[in-house]
Interface confidence: medium
Amino acid sequence: KVFGRCELAAAMKRHGLDNYRGYSLGNWVCAAKFESNFNTQATNRNTDGSTDYGILQINSRWWCNDGRTPGSRNLCNIPCSALLSSDITASVNCAKKIVSDGNGMNAWVAWRNRCKGTDVQAWIRGCRL
């Protein structure tokens, strides 16, 4: 599923991401935009043999199990395919674990490069939340 901007903002808010670990909702929507272009079925392969999955491009080396990433830790204890569902619950729950890990949203390269320090509130402007 490819979410609309406000549709995703509303879904993320419903799942408790607004101000989770101090990160406003706009940060999460911005991250999703530049990680997956709001596409729940996005997959991208990395040079280390791992793959990033879903709307927040969660990595199989650390967070989920795709059955083929050497040394996978599967810290979210889920199959990576669960992160590709049109229901974003699994992605949100795993993202909460990631953002609590110590590096905050710096764990997402796209957030670091494209969202951090910008007017992230623009990503939820005009949305009925």
């Epitope: 079925q41 040079t47 043999g49 795709d66 059955g67 083929r68 050497p70 590709l84």
Partner: antibody, heavy 116, light 107 residues
């Protein structure tokens, strides 16, 4: 136990298309990548590409882009590979395998012969 | 693409001999190298994964070693059922690639 059952041998004319199937049993089909591999005598094994059935995400070896197309039907736990514009170079045994990085589980292979 | 070169192309041995098969990668692939055995008209069978981990059900006479670019499959005291083709495969990057194979034949 995990099993991959491929469709039977095919004899096709040059220029035609063929669709090979791979039915998976014994595991959660949507969760694992399915890989496709070509084997020709004297050419060893070649990786064609892969599909994640749960999402339909696909990746192709550049060499096979435009030649192979992958699809999957999660309701029947079956993956498909269509090969188009067949030539004699496509005559080979085609395997599906479960994509665990290494390939512990293979289909029995589908022999494709392209001949006029 | 990562190229895998296997040597020798053919190995003629007598049952009871011990042999080593080589697989060399064109660039470092860490330990992401797997070995398969294939008999005529059969699918490949996984023997060794991640350079040195024996797949369950594979006899202990098969062992693997190496890291980076140079890998070895060793068969300690070859048995008649071991004859066939042996392939290496890398999973370090895409596209996945295979070696050209080593044929193990009876002398």
């Amino acid at each position: 136990q995990v099993q991959l059952q491929e469709s039977g041998a095919e004899v096709m004319k040059p220029g035609a298309s063929v669709k090979i199937s791979c039915k998976a049993t014994g595991y959660t089909f949507s969760t694992y990548w399915i890989e496709w591999v070509k084997q020709r005598p004297g050419h060893g094994l070649e990786w064609i590409g892969e599909i994640l059935p749960g999402s339909g995400s696909t990746y192709y070896n550049e060499k096979f882009k435009g030649k192979a197309t992958f699809t999957a039907d999660t309701s029947s736990n079956t993956a498909y590979m269509q090969l188009s514009s067949l030539t004699s170079e496509d005559s080979a045994v085609y395997y599906c395998a479960r994509g665990d990085g290494n390939y512990c589980y293979w289909g029995q292979g589908t022999t494709l012969t392209v001949s006029s | 693409d990562i190229e895998l070169t296997q040597s020798p192309a053919t190995l003629s041995v007598t049952p009871g001999d011990s042999v080593s098969l080589s697989c060399r990668a064109s660039q470092s692939i860490s330990n992401n190298l797997h070995w398969y055995q294939q008999k005529p008209h059969e699918s490949p069978r996984l023997l060794i994964k991640y350079a040195s981990q024996r797949q369950s059900g594979i006899p202990s006479r098969f062992s693997g070693s190496g890291s980076g670019t140079d890998f070895t499959l060793s068969i300690n005291s070859v048995e008649t059922e071991d004859f066939g083709m042996y392939f290496c495969q890398q999973s370090n990057s895409w596209p996945r690639t295979f070696g050209g194979g080593t044929k193990l034949e009876i002398k």
